[in-house]
């Protein structure tokens, strides 16, 4: 009579997530008499996958009939697979008996399940920098299987250098996460530039998932100020204009001041955008300068998102 | 706890039916046959036929071909056994059995039986 | 289809007696065959399976032995709560067949 073997022929199997796994397992005898059970891991902390005998298994089912007789077929078929079904399975052949006595495993089939990255997020800095400054954008994602992932970084489609990537943990997991920070140095011209975050893996066959962070919210024009005098009209009335040019956001807050004291204030809104993102605007203020003795010192004094107000002023001279 | 629970007794008429069911708990049930054997009164186990809870496939012996059907509803764990054309010779208590083919080739488990009369 | 004949179909015997009962399929089946108790008005029940293997939760008292076509049964000691009706059973191959029963009464 030959000794019993339990054969399990694939040493691995690899399923992408949401497939099923079949795990072959074959007896070279019907001898002696007992069932059939499988178990993920070895040792006392092993886990039942399937036993023919008793239990509830709803995502396993025999790949042959066990009730038919002569059937030395004790595959399994294990549906909709998550990484967290990775691990190495065991097919153990028992003596009945009371209780059942281990007889014989299979060697152990390796099951590892790949799974797609998690569509990449990206986050900015939480507060913005002006031009020439370096920021740090922040790209993650999760979930995937295998290891091995390549991230890449794009400011409006020029690859960049400057950032670190992690890939956790370190050791053997179900699953992985990646994490990448990459630096970015902030120019004027930036309001519409885009970073992307690119992940390609195995298991999207050549298509990388991206994840984009627009400039925008990461990046704080300052305003230029200008402030010029009109002609004098012919009711003494001189107009001053304040030109606030090149900003971003559009957040502002105008003050005139005349001599020291609050003449206006104005908020800008629904402001045209120029090519580059930025706005402009422009502020006027009359003066009567038949009503001051003395020059009118005038200051226009700009509040940008919540920044340090920025002052310029102008002397009106009043003839005598 | 393992079990099968077998329906209520019958009395049938002759040329009537009658659908016996078995009702498994506490394992696996796709994973064993279920037989069913009869016993008449005084007389020695009968085996009728078999069915896989697995597949539904099925096997019937010889003398009862054509009379018999055997089904099972996996939703619920339930063996049914319907027989035909009643005589009186089909008076007896129907048993269900669990049988496990590729590993163990016996009856370890038993319904209590369902007794059929069959009179006119 | 296999034939199992079982000899005696009854035997009287006494608390303490050792009792053999046979069975003789009409063709080789291997280890395939079973012993089953029976009493009045209950289900058969498991005793050896796979001709020589005690069932869980039965006394040692029972034993099985044979292979191909010759089985034996056998009570070493018997005991009060043992008079009852046994059967072998053939598990070889389709139509499963049962022996015809050996009643075993007291003396």
């Known amino acids: 009579e030959e000794e019993l073997q339990v054969i399990q022929p694939e040493k691995s199997v690899s399923v992408a997530a949401g497939e099923s796994a079949t795990l072959n397992c074959t007896a070279t005898s019907l001898i002696p008499v007992g069932p059939i059970q499988w178990f993920r891991g070895v040792g006392p902390g092993r886990e039942l996958i399937y036993s023919q005998k008793e239990g509830h298994f709803p995502r396993v089912t025999p790949v042959s009939d066990p009730t038919k007789r002569n059937n030395m077929d004790f595959s399994i078929r294990i549906s909709n697979i998550t990484p967290a079904d990775a691990g190495t399975y065991y097919c153990v052949k028992f003596r009945k008996g009371s209780p059942d006595v281990e007889l014989k495993s299979g060697a152990g089939t390796e099951l590892s399940v790949r799974a797609k990255p998690s569509a990449p997020v990206v986050s900015g800095p939480a507060v913005r920098a002006t031009a020439e400054h370096t920021v740090s954008f922040t790209c993650e994602s999760h979930g995937f299987s295998p290891r091995d992932i390549t991230l890449k970084w794009f400011k409006n489609g020029n690859e960049l250098s400057d950032f670190q990537t992690n890939v956790d943990p370190a050791g053997k997991s179900v699953s992985y996460s990646i994490r990448s920070t990459a630096r970015v140095v902030l120019t004027r011209r930036d309001v519409h530039s885009q970073v992307i975050c690119e992940v390609a893996h195995v298991t999207l066959q050549g298509d990388p998932l991206r994840g984009t962070a627009n400039l925008s919210e990461a990046i704080r024009v300052p305003p230029f100020l200008e402030v010029t005098q009109q002609s004098m009209r012919a009711d003494n009335q001189v107009n001053v204009t304040c030109q606030v040019t090149k900003f971003y956001p559009q957040r502002l807050q105008l003050t005139w001041l005349e001599n020291g004291n609050v003449s206006r204030t104005e908020m800008a809104s629904a402001l045209p955008e120029n090519k580059d993102g930025t706005y402009n605007w422009t502020s006027w203020l009359l003066v009567n300068v038949s009503a001051h003795r003395d020059d009118v010192k005038l200051t226009c004094q700009v509040e940008h998102d919540g920044q340090p107000a920025v002052n310029k002023s102008f002397s009106v001279k009043v003839s005598a | 706890q393992v079990q099968l629970v077998q329906s209520g007794a019958e009395v049938k008429k002759p040329g009537a039916s009658v659908k016996v069911s078995c009702k498994a708990s506490g394992y696996t049930f796709h994973g064993y046959g279920i037989s069913w054997v009869r016993q008449a009164p005084g007389q020695g186990l009968e085996w009728m036929g078999w069915?896989?809870?697995?597949?539904?496939?099925?096997n019937y012996a010889q003398k009862l071909q054509g009379r018999v059907t055997m089904t099972t509803d996996t939703s619920t764990s339930t063996a049914y056994m319907e027989l035909r054309s009643l005589r009186s010779d089909d008076t007896a208590v129907y048993y269900c059995a669990r049988e496990a083919g590729s590993s163990w080739y016996d009856f370890d488990l038993w319904g209590r039986g369902t007794l059929v009369t069959v009179s006119s | 289809d296999i034939q199992m004949t079982q000899s005696p179909s009854s035997v009287s015997a006494s608390v303490g007696d050792r009792v053999t009962i046979t069975c003789r399929a009409s063709?080789?089946?291997?280890?395939?065959l079973a012993w089953y108790q029976q009493k009045p008005g209950k289900a058969p029940k498991l005793l050896i399976y796979?001709?020589?293997n005690l069932q869980s939760g039965v006394p040692s008292r029972f034993s099985g032995s044979g292979s191909g076509t010759d089985f034996t049964l056998t009570i070493s000691s018997l005991q009060p709560e043992d008079f009852a009706t046994y059967y072998c059973?053939?598990?070889?191959?389709?139509?499963?067949?049962f022996g015809g029963g050996t009643k075993v009464e007291i003396k």
């Open positions: 059973q053939q598990g070889a191959s389709f139509p499963i067949t």
């Open positions: 069915i896989s809870a697995y597949s539904g496939e099925t």
């Open positions: 796979a001709a020589s």
């Open positions: 063709q080789g089946i291997s280890s395939w």
